[in-house]
């Protein structure tokens, strides 16, 4: 008996052959002998199957002694043997219907478990093998589980289903909802602009939900809400922001943040939570600021910075075209008499600048320039 | 959106080897019978070659044993395999999906023109 | 195989009048014929499938009769986007054939 395996909603054709090559009478009946379909001279007929609407042949084939079952639209229930009568013959055919569904949305929030459930006829003993789209192999039976979905797992999950020695094929295309970024940091002197940018790492046609950042900076004790909003069909509208600082909000995706000036007292690390509409859980995204201020108080030249700085950054002050006079694994620096010229306040990270603010020191009989 | 797109065409000698592609999106190609459909300058349209849903291969006496017709599920891609061209197989070449119950064409794609010259 | 002949070759005609193709098989095949619609540098167009069924989309003045060996194409009230060539094909039987085509002009 030959088998053929099926798609749940796909089409299949089953295959019937006459020794001639002419039209002749066939009927497919299945395994309880209802008739499914034949032909009267060049007219298909159809039988009180259940798959009536479902079911046809192909006119086209049948003078080359081609009668072929084809059931469209296939469901688990489908799964039977099919027996085609021609020419004093019966063809048989066990056809095997096999469904591969996520367990929920296939739109999944990262850090979340993905599970997909294979759909299977009885008696039917089949194994499934899913590849991701970063490459990873999953073994399983009726239910494989893959936890802590990670953005690299967005994409086509290809599955293959195994019975009898035949095997069937499943796309199923995933997307883990997160952002570009798990972490960033920006780096501003005192008194610039600071531009936070959170871009999604996936799109969708509509877009709906709330988020909020709330920011620790590092001079409180405690992290308040900066900035709330609302996200309908892509389109941002401010809810609630603080009088200080008072941050301004793109009303277009990516969420853009723009905070009018970088202090001491806004230093620190933020987390921007968003949780979208039907979904269980929030997206999150952290982000840090440092801040640098260079100052000269009589003879003392001072640079600092203010913010999450990792313990191997290097803060130096040097004057222009020279060597470092002071460079400290340190939050702080400063050269006492410092002599004229312009110095530089430099942040760096393995010789990559990542910070840089001048200061312009004048003659001792005047006030220091800040460029 | 339903769409069918043929690449492959071109220039190519008598005895000479050519491969068609025919890409689709918007439905899922093994669901379908699919064929190759021709038409030559100036010249009606001609029946080339089909796969059907099974994947059971039928060709037009024209082309039988040059031809070879093929399909990839997983990339949703028909192809047309034309071996010993003759200047007769030049034409322009359109994939179209057959209906789900008749051997009529219901989506055609733009067409790749194959032209066989010395 | 199943010879199809369509007539006539082409014909000239204004916008509004009523336009009739013929294609006659050679060979009884039943109501299994379809209609196709071309225009320069395109694909064809599906018009009309087992002799009378219109395609979704098709306009209403597009009608198709006829079985067994003779079928009919009619356009009751040609419109401009109607100039075009016009091929029958049977469905019938494998090797598929299709008429060599009407082409519409401009009176």
């Known amino acids: 008996k030959k088998v053929v395996l099926g798609k749940k909603g796909d089409t299949v054709e089953l295959t019937c052959t006459a020794s001639q090559k002419k039209s002749i009478q066939f009927h497919w009946k299945n395994s309880n002998q209802i008739k499914i379909l034949g032909n009267q001279g060049s007219f298909l007929t159809k039988g009180p199957s259940k798959l009536n609407d479902r079911a046809d042949s192909r006119r086209s084939l049948w003078d080359q002694g081609n009668f072929p079952l084809i059931i469209k639209n296939l469901k688990i229930e489908d799964s039977d043997t099919y027996i085609c009568e021609v020419e004093d013959q019966k063809e048989e055919v066990q056809l095997l219907v096999f469904g591969l569904t996520a367990n929920s949305d296939t739109h999944l929030l990262q850090g979340q478990s993905l599970t997909l459930t294979l759909e299977s006829p009885p008696g039917s003993s089949p194994s499934v093998q899913c590849r991701s789209p970063r490459g990873k192999n999953i073994q399983g039976g009726k239910t494989l589980s893959v936890s802590q979905l990670e953005l690299q797992d967005s994409g086509t999950w290809t599955c293959t289903v195994l019975q009898n020695q035949k095997k069937v094929e499943f796309k199923i295309d995933i997307v883990v909802l997160a952002f570009q970024k798990a972490s960033s940091i920006v780096y501003k002197k005192e008194g610039e602009q600071v531009e936070f940018s959170f871009p999604l790492a996936f799109t969708v046609e509509k877009l709906t939900g709330s988020g909020e950042l709330w920011w620790q900076a590092e001079r409180a004790s405690s992290s308040k809400s900066w900035i709330t909003f609302d996200l309908k069909n892509k389109e941002v509208s401010v809810k609630r922001v603080t009088q200080d600082p008072k941050l301004q909000m793109g009303k277009k995706l990516p969420l853009h943040l723009t905070l009018p000036q970088a202090l001491p007292q806004y230093a620190g690390s933020g987390n921007l939570t968003l949780a979208l509409e039907a979904k269980t859980g929030k997206l999150h995204q952290e982000v840090n600021l440092v801040v640098m201020r260079a100052t000269q108080l009589q003879k003392n030249l001072t640079c600092e910075v203010w913010g999450p700085t990792s313990p191997k950054l290097m803060l130096s002050l040097k004057l222009e075209n020279k060597e470092a006079k002071v460079s400290k694994r340190e939050k702080a620096v400063w050269v006492l008499n410092p002599e004229a010229g312009m110095w530089q306040c430099l942040l760096s990270d393995s010789g990559q600048v990542l910070l840089e603010s001048n200061i312009k020191v004048l003659p001792t009989w005047s006030t220091p320039v800040q460029p | 959106e339903v769409q069918l797109v043929e690449s492959g065409g071109g220039l190519v000698k008598p005895g000479g080897s050519l491969r068609l592609s025919c890409a689709a999106s918007?439905?899922?190609?093994?669901?379908?019978?699919t064929s190759w459909v021709r038409q030559a300058p100036g010249k009606g349209l001609e029946w080339v070659s089909a796969?059907?849903?099974?994947?059971?291969?039928y060709y037009a006496d024209s082309v039988k044993g040059r031809f070879t017709i093929s399909r990839d599920d997983s990339k949703n891609t028909l192809y047309l395999q034309m071996n010993s061209l003759k200047t007769e197989d030049t034409a322009v070449y359109y994939c179209a999906r057959e209906g789900w119950n008749d051997d009529v064409f219901d989506i055609w794609g733009q067409g790749t023109m194959v032209t066989v010259s010395s | 195989d199943i010879q199809m002949t369509q007539s006539p070759s082409s014909l000239s005609a204004s916008v509004g009048d009523r336009v009739t193709i013929t294609c006659q098989a050679s060979q009884d095949i039943s109501t299994w014929l379809a209609w196709y619609q071309q225009k320069p540098g395109k694909a064809p167009k599906l018009l009309i499938y087992?002799?009378?069924t219109l395609e979704s989309g098709v306009p209403s003045r597009f009608s198709g009769s006829g079985s067994g060996t003779d079928f009919t194409l009619t356009i009751s009230s040609l419109q401009p986007e109607d100039f075009a060539t016009y091929y029958c094909q049977q469905s019938y039987s494998i090797p598929l054939t299709f008429g060599g085509g009407t082409k519409v002009e401009i009176k």
């Open positions: 796969i059907g849903a099974g994947g059971g291969t």
């Open positions: 087992r002799a009378s």
């Open positions: 918007g439905f899922t190609f093994s669901n379908h019978y």
